[in-house]
């Protein structure tokens, strides 16, 4: 695994190839989760943020940007989206929490907690996932589309198997999250594919 | 196999400062945290602090933050524990541990150290 | 700083007793603990981790449950190997902290 604290993932253009593929061996299903990361682009289409398949499972779990100001959390193939007032183009550092026995899930947007919203009320996440970082799946670890592609830069990406209280959340947006046993910036196990580059997080 | 080897046992003055080796082999050293943990005669396992080797960010316990410095040197696969001001109770058989592959426990662990402070 | 409190702090057994130690976080860590297993003059060996599963190598007999504040190791049929003493510790918030110990000792 490797240290990545103070370096991003940089997609420097549109494709349908390039992405990095994040390496976890979970291994039970998920009731509930806390993802955080910071995240950078001047893309005002829409795109992928984080995209979670499993095997016969499309946007199990996915984080997507459907314009400026609008975020949706995928669960197991149902949407919610929040929105919130925000600046373009603008660093942005995302946290999203789902708990599958309330079936909230709740967007922090820069330290500030959107409106909650409900969905899929007693689901479970399916374990061993492919997860990708510049690209949305359509299949497990593939079928990627030009037009959901990422450009820009990710990076202090975290992932908890619980619901972080606020003052963690903070505490990820200030740049000292706890321990991730999920997946974890300063210990990530992760594969790129195609032209992506590592650089210095110049941005926060 | 993948090991840890220590460096040997201390006897210190109080005041003065003890650096422990901790030598890795049987695995790529860059990349995995190494943490130190300190026992106490009779006592329980204390978290002093880690560090990883390849990015040098470390993170230590409040505890010992203004008195230990954890640093790693790639080119001999060695971190090193460095534990000034010390007194007595520092007395202790202090461990080197590597990180897991994926989670935040210990799954190697050194021979222990035994740093004895006093006067 | 979380306190990880382990009971019974000592234990006298037979082999072959199934026997029992707990642990309770000061607050929830979740499922992020672990259990180690340390013989004298020795360094602690890795037996659980995310509080239910079992390290690479080690025997079935040793098991772990709990969640939030509250944690078990179980040991289903003692053999003398594992007359020692265990930890329990949690990494679900800097610093690392352990529990106290419980030695397991021959009735």
């Known amino acids: 695994h490797t240290d990545l604290s103070g370096k991003v993932f940089v997609f420097p253009r549109e494709s349908v190839t390039d992405h990095v593929n994040l390496i976890t061996p979970l291994e039970k299903p998920l009731q509930n989760f806390t993802l955080c990361f910071r995240a950078y682009s001047d893309l005002s289409r829409a795109y992928s943020l984080f995209s979670y398949n499993t095997q016969g499972r499309d946007n199990e779990l996915l984080v997507y940007k459907e314009r400026v100001g609008e975020y949706s959390l995928y669960i197991g193939r149902h949407k919610v989206t929040s929105k919130v007032i925000e600046k373009f183009p603008a660093p942005v550092h995302i946290c999203v929490s789902w708990e599958s026995s309330s079936g909230i899930a709740e967007f922090w947007i820069n330290g500030t907690p959107l409106v909650k919203k409900g969905l899929r009320q007693g689901y479970f996440v399916e374990a061993q996932p492919k997860i990708v970082l510049g690209q949305e799946q359509d299949s497990y670890g593939g079928k990627f589309d030009r037009s959901q592609s990422f450009v820009g830069e990710i990076g202090d990406l975290y992932m908890w198997d619980s619901v972080l209280p606020p003052e963690n959340i903070l505490s990820a947006y200030q740049g000292t999250p706890l321990p991730a046993n999920i997946l974890d910036w300063q210990a990530l196990n992760y594969e790129i594919r195609g032209y992506v580059i590592i650089k210095p997080l110049v941005w926060v | 196999q993948v090991q840890l080897v220590q460096s040997g046992a201390e006897v210190k003055k109080p005041g003065s400062s003890v650096k422990v080796s901790c030598k890795a082999s049987?695995?790529?050293?860059?990349?995995?945290?190494m943490h130190w943990v300190r026992q106490a005669p009779g006592q329980g396992l204390e978290w002093m602090g880690m560090i990883h080797p390849n990015s040098v960010n470390t993170n230590y316990n409040e505890k010992f933050k203004s008195r230990v410095t954890i640093t790693a040197d790639k080119s001999t696969s060695t971190a090193y524990m460095e534990l000034s001001s010390l007194r007595s109770e520092d007395t202790a058989v202090y461990y080197c541990?590597?990180?897991?592959?994926?989670?935040?426990?210990?799954?190697?662990w050194g021979q222990g150290t035994l740093v004895t402070v006093s006067s | 700083d979380i306190q990880m409190t382990q009971s019974p702090s000592s234990l006298s057994a037979s082999v072959g007793d199934r026997v029992t130690i707990t642990c309770k976080a000061s607050?929830?860590?979740?499922?992020?603990v672990a259990w180690y297993q340390q013989k004298p003059g020795k360094a602690p060996k890795l037996l659980i981790y995310s509080a239910s599963y079992r390290y690479s190598g080690v025997p079935s007999r040793f098991s772990g449950s709990g969640s939030g504040t509250d944690f078990t190791l179980t040991i289903s049929s003692l053999q003398p190997e594992d007359f020692a003493t265990y930890y329990c510790q949690q990494c679900n918030n800097y610093p690392f902290t352990f529990g106290q110990g419980t030695k397991l000792e021959i009735k």
């Open positions: 607050q929830n860590v979740n499922s992020n």
């Open positions: 049987g695995y790529t050293f860059t990349s995995y945290w």
């Open positions: 541990a590597r990180r897991n592959d994926y989670y935040w426990y210990f799954d190697v």
